[in-house]
């Protein structure tokens, strides 16, 4: 069961001093959202009790496994159902809190009542205001029963429910007909899934005998043992004032657990602590009642004397519940409450016994769930005790369960039972995660979903080349770090699986599914170097590279030429793809710019070591395009252009030059120069006649510069086919003076 | 669904005796406060007799005090009413109903009413 | 015992709202006992139609509610249809052993 008690703080004379504190002792406990899951809830159920609404109660949360509710400022706030939830995933756990009113009408004599499936149960709720009208009982807030008053039996209502069954649980409440409700007598009823002393799916197996008032588990078979008790069956007591699983907490405050009443998870309910008793858990136990509600009697024999925390405590020489074994009788010593065994394993139990006379190897044995007897293969006999070794046939699932050690001699005997879970080996339902690949290594994050039980002690990971059938490689990793596969061959496939083993002996899961992860290419080894460069215009550069020449294929796919304008910082890369290539052209440069330039060979995603980089200028931009261009035809093979020079030149222009192209032609254009850059007229000579041209031209500083606008034109007449454009030129103002 | 059938009415002269049965269905019989209420031709309801769940409480209008007997037995789910000394006056239709109690708010107390009724049976006491 | 004193008839036209008194004493309806409400057609049982004087079980209608005053108990049907055309009756305890119904009352759809 969940380690989770729900305490309340019963001392009730300011309402405002109540607190409930809902505590609990599993591994990381109520941290919220991390690996632990949801964190405690503590609140008050209003869906069957309610109560007028109050100010708001406040939560606090003291540390990862301790919440508390205060803010009480009424004794009405008190009354009701409180739930505290805690525990991860299936084993999520309500502990419930009902809460009556001290100054009720009618009051519980026993709030909390744990039956079995079909038993009767009976709620008396006693008369402590009376009221001469009809007493109404209702079940989860809902009509149930009616009583008349006339029908009380010694000053109280009682309910008989005959063959309860589990859905018959939940809330009952006894109140007079015109009373509030928060006069009520509230119960809360448990039904067992079982009949008295079994648990399981079909209430076949049976419980382990839970002792001080401990109640078993109809789900798992196991105790619920009450405050202020431990183990297997709850034979042990805690230290006074201290309870939990395993007796870790320990109540709040100087007197103890005087005045906290205590709620654990079903079907055990709720009930003062250890010593303690009444309906505010502040009475002592009477002489000779021990244990939770006091509800235990010590009966002590030999001169035992009665610890109302922990039962009889016995005098030197004898031992038992009631000091009734004498130590001459056998005894079971330090047995483990509880033993944890991988499934299909063959584990050796070991039982040790003590007594007068001395057991012996044939007076010890070992009782399974299922009733086989188990005879020890072997005894250890010491001074003090005879230790009997049992070899435990290969153990299947059903073998979960409470098992016996009985030793029997002519002085008596003596049993002790104790817990063997069987759990299952981890198996990987998932193959492993590839995260990095390198050719030579893989990271591989190897955690993965599994089926069977935790938890993961160790994660072997296996692998080998695809389609080999060589021996797996395996490494041992860490179940929380990622795993690096070294030394592998590159662009290889290899398939890799996952083995998940837990604690103990045939922990090891089988190896979950396989998956296939490929190692990178070879790195290319080779340096290249630039054997130079040539600017081919003010944004087009052509580059040129040799490798050293090595024996063997080239192991590279082609090369990367990277370019750097470390002025804007700006990065230009140019795949060439052809591993052959030792020259390639780069267009679409920014003019005026100084570049770093290197070139790497490169292989898959890889690339080789860069070559050593070299530094290129390339010139600036040419001027901007010349103005106003104009086209006049002269004859049938001459035509006349004009234009205004270029504004915001960067300097002295040092030619123009003039692109001719005959218009709807398919051939190439002509380039002419114009080298007396002070001119803004030329006459393009020897052009065809009735011919239309079109006519474009650019200025050049260090570089060429924009074109202009294009213009038509057509020549005149139908002259003799010319033998191709040619250019006089002469400034504009002579052209107009004349 | 929640059925109640009374029956035994009928004919009887002044100073015999009838017995009327209700039948109950649809819900757990024995959990549940019983009534007898009767209505003569053309006049109003009136109530006649109480019962407890447990048979141990009972309680009778003053007219009927004395001769007529309520009782249920629970293990057949089935209310009664056994009429002695039958006058002219007790002619009516004898229904049969349900006590339920309502939680109206929550915080209040619940209230009773008689949730659902038989179809009725007629007693004709004549000469 | 008494019965509870409720006016013998009360009408109104479609739409409108009709309002029935029960008077009773401080023995019943003016005590701390719940008042309760019926409607019965001809011919049929009677349906519960309020409990505790104000409070209307699932399945009927808003348009009945109730209220009390000292020893006087009263049912407004608002907004009157021609299916309300029956029988009224308001009904008390006294003690808890002892039940009492009102005279009735005739309600008519004009």
């Known amino acids: 069961a969940v380690d989770l008690t729900l305490l309340a703080n019963l001392r009730l004379t300011d309402p405002q001093r109540f607190f409930l504190t809902c505590v609990s002792g599993e591994a990381g406990a109520g941290r919220g959202s991390d690996a632990w899951g949801p964190p405690l809830l503590l609140e008050k159920d209003d869906r069957i009790v309610r109560t007028p609404p109050g100010p708001p109660l406040r939560l606090a949360r003291n540390g990862s496994h301790q919440v508390t509710l205060r803010g009480f400022s009424k004794p009405s706030d008190l009354v009701g159902v409180f739930s505290c939830v805690g525990g991860a995933g299936a084993r999520r756990t309500r502990v419930i809190y009902v809460h009556n009113s001290p100054g009720a009408h009618l009051l519980p004599d026993k709030v909390t009542h744990t039956v079995n499936k079909g038993d009767t149960a009976v709620l008396s709720a006693r008369v402590h205001k009376e009221k001469q009208t009809d007493v109404i009982w209702k079940s989860n807030g809902s009509y149930f029963y009616t009583l008349d008053w006339h029908e009380a039996q010694d000053g109280r209502f009682l309910l008989q429910l005959p063959n309860v069954q589990p859905p018959s649980s939940g809330i009952y409440s006894a109140t007079y007909l015109e009373a509030s409700p928060l006069g009520s007598a509230f119960f809360r009823l448990i039904v067992r899934g079982c009949g008295a002393g079994r648990w399981g799916p079909g209430c076949t197996k049976e419980c382990p005998g839970c002792l001080h008032g401990g109640v078993c588990h109809d789900h798992d078979g196991e105790c619920v043992c009450p405050p202020g008790f431990t183990g297997t069956r709850c034979e042990q007591a805690c230290r006074e004032g201290r309870f939990g699983q395993s007796c870790q907490e320990q109540c709040p405050g100087i007197s103890g657990c005087r005045g906290l009443t205590f709620c654990l998870p079903d079907p055990y309910g709720c009930s003062c602590g250890s010593g303690w008793r009444g309906s505010q858990c502040q009475e002592a136990c009477a002489p000779g009642h021990f244990g939770a509600d006091c509800r235990l009697q010590c009966q002590c024999q030999n001169g035992g004397t009665c610890d109302r925390f922990s039962g009889c405590v016995c005098p030197s020489g004898w031992h038992g519940v009631h000091c009734e074994k004498s130590d001459r009788i056998p005894q079971i010593l330090n047995m483990a409450s509880e033993l944890e065994f991988n499934l299909e394993t063959m584990p050796r139990i070991n039982c040790a016994a003590a007594g007068n006379p001395f057991p012996v190897r044939g007076s010890i044995e070992l009782r399974k769930p299922d009733g086989t007897v188990l005879l020890s293969t072997k005894a250890i006999v010491e001074p003090e005790k005879t230790t009997a070794e049992f070899e435990v046939p290969r153990l299947v699932l059903a073998d979960s369960g409470f098992w016996e050690c009985r030793v029997s001699t002519s002085g008596g005997q003596d049993s002790r039972r104790f817990k063997v879970n069987v759990k299952v080996p981890p198996v990987p339902l998932a193959a492993p995660r590839l995260l990095t690949k390198q050719s030579r290594q893989l990271v591989v994050s190897p955690l993965v979903s599994f089926s069977g039980d935790g938890p993961i002690s160790t994660v072997r990971l296996h692998y080998r080349p695809q389609d080999s059938t060589m021996d797996w490689s395996t490494i041992v990793v860490d179940p929380s770090e990622n795993v690096t596969l070294m030394n592998l061959r590159p662009k290889t496939g290899y398939s890799v699986r996952v083995q998940l083993s837990r604690p103990g002996e045939g922990g090891e899961g089988a190896w979950g599914p396989p998956t296939l992860m490929t190692t990178d290419c070879p790195e290319p080894l080779l340096q290249p170097w630039l054997e130079g460069w040539h600017v081919e215009g003010t944004d087009r550069l052509r580059v040129s590279w040799s490798l050293p020449l090595v024996p063997g294929p080239l192991v590279g796919d082609g090369f990367l030429l990277r370019l750097w304008d470390g002025t804007r910082g700006q990065e230009r890369r140019e795949n060439v793809s052809s591993p052959q290539a030792r020259t390639a052209l780069l267009t679409g440069l920014t003019p005026g710019t100084h570049y770093q330039l290197d070139v790497q060979l490169y292989h898959c995603t890889l690339l080789g070591p860069a070559s050593p980089p070299a530094h290129v200028l390339l010139p600036p931009s040419g001027p901007p395009a010349p103005r106003h261009l104009h086209a006049q035809a002269l004859s049938d093979s001459e035509i006349q252009l004009t234009w205004k020079h270029p504004e915001a030149l960067p300097g002295p222009i040092s030619k123009y030059v003039v692109e001719v192209q005959v218009a709807g032609g398919a051939g190439d254009p002509l380039w002419i120069d114009v080298d007396r850059p002070e001119e803004t007229s030329t006459i393009i000579r020897g052009l065809n006649a009735s011919t239309r041209y079109l006519f474009r031209m650019r200025a050049s500083i260090q570089g060429l510069g924009d074109w202009s606008n294009t213009v038509e034109e057509s020549t005149l007449g139908n002259g003799l086919q010319a033998e191709g454009p040619v250019q006089e030129s002469r400034a504009a103002e002579e052209g107009l003076d004349q | 669904e929640v059925q109640l059938l009374e029956s035994g009415g009928g004919l009887v002269q002044p100073g015999g005796s009838l017995r009327l049965s209700c039948a109950a269905s649809g819900f757990t019989f024995s959990r549940y406060k019983m009534k007898w209420v009767r209505q003569a031709p053309g006049k109003g309801l009136e109530w006649v007799s109480v019962?407890?769940?447990?048979?141990?409480?009972?309680g009778y209008a003053d007219s009927v005090k004395g001769r007529f007997t309520i009782s249920r037995d629970n293990s057949k789910n089935t209310l009664y009413l056994q009429m002695n000394s039958l006058r002219a006056e007790d002619t009516a239709v004898y229904y049969c109903?349900?006590?339920?109690?309502?939680?109206?708010?929550?915080?209040?107390?619940?209230?009773?009413?008689?949730?659902?009724w038989g179809q009725g049976t007629l007693v004709t006491v004549s000469s | 015992q008494s019965v509870l004193t409720q006016p013998d008839s009360v009408s109104g036209s479609p739409g409108e709202s009709i309002t029935i008194s029960c008077t009773g004493s401080s023995r019943d309806v003016g005590g701390y006992n719940y008042v309760s409400w019926y409607q019965q057609h001809p011919g049929k049982a009677p349906k519960l139609l309020l409990y505790?004087?104000?409070y209307r079980p699932s399945g009927i209608s808003g348009r009945f509610s109730g209220s009390k005053s000292g020893d006087t108990a009263s049912l407004t049907i608002s907004g009157l249809r021609t299916e309300d055309e029956a029988d009224y009756y308001c009904s008390s305890s006294i003690g808890t052993r002892t039940y009492v119904f009102g005279s009735g009352t005739k309600v008519t759809v004009l």
């Open positions: 109903a349900r006590v339920n109690y309502y939680d109206s708010s929550g915080y209040g107390p619940i209230a009773p009413g008689l949730d659902y």
């Open positions: 505790d004087v104000t």
């Open positions: 019962i407890y769940p447990s048979g141990g409480g009972t």
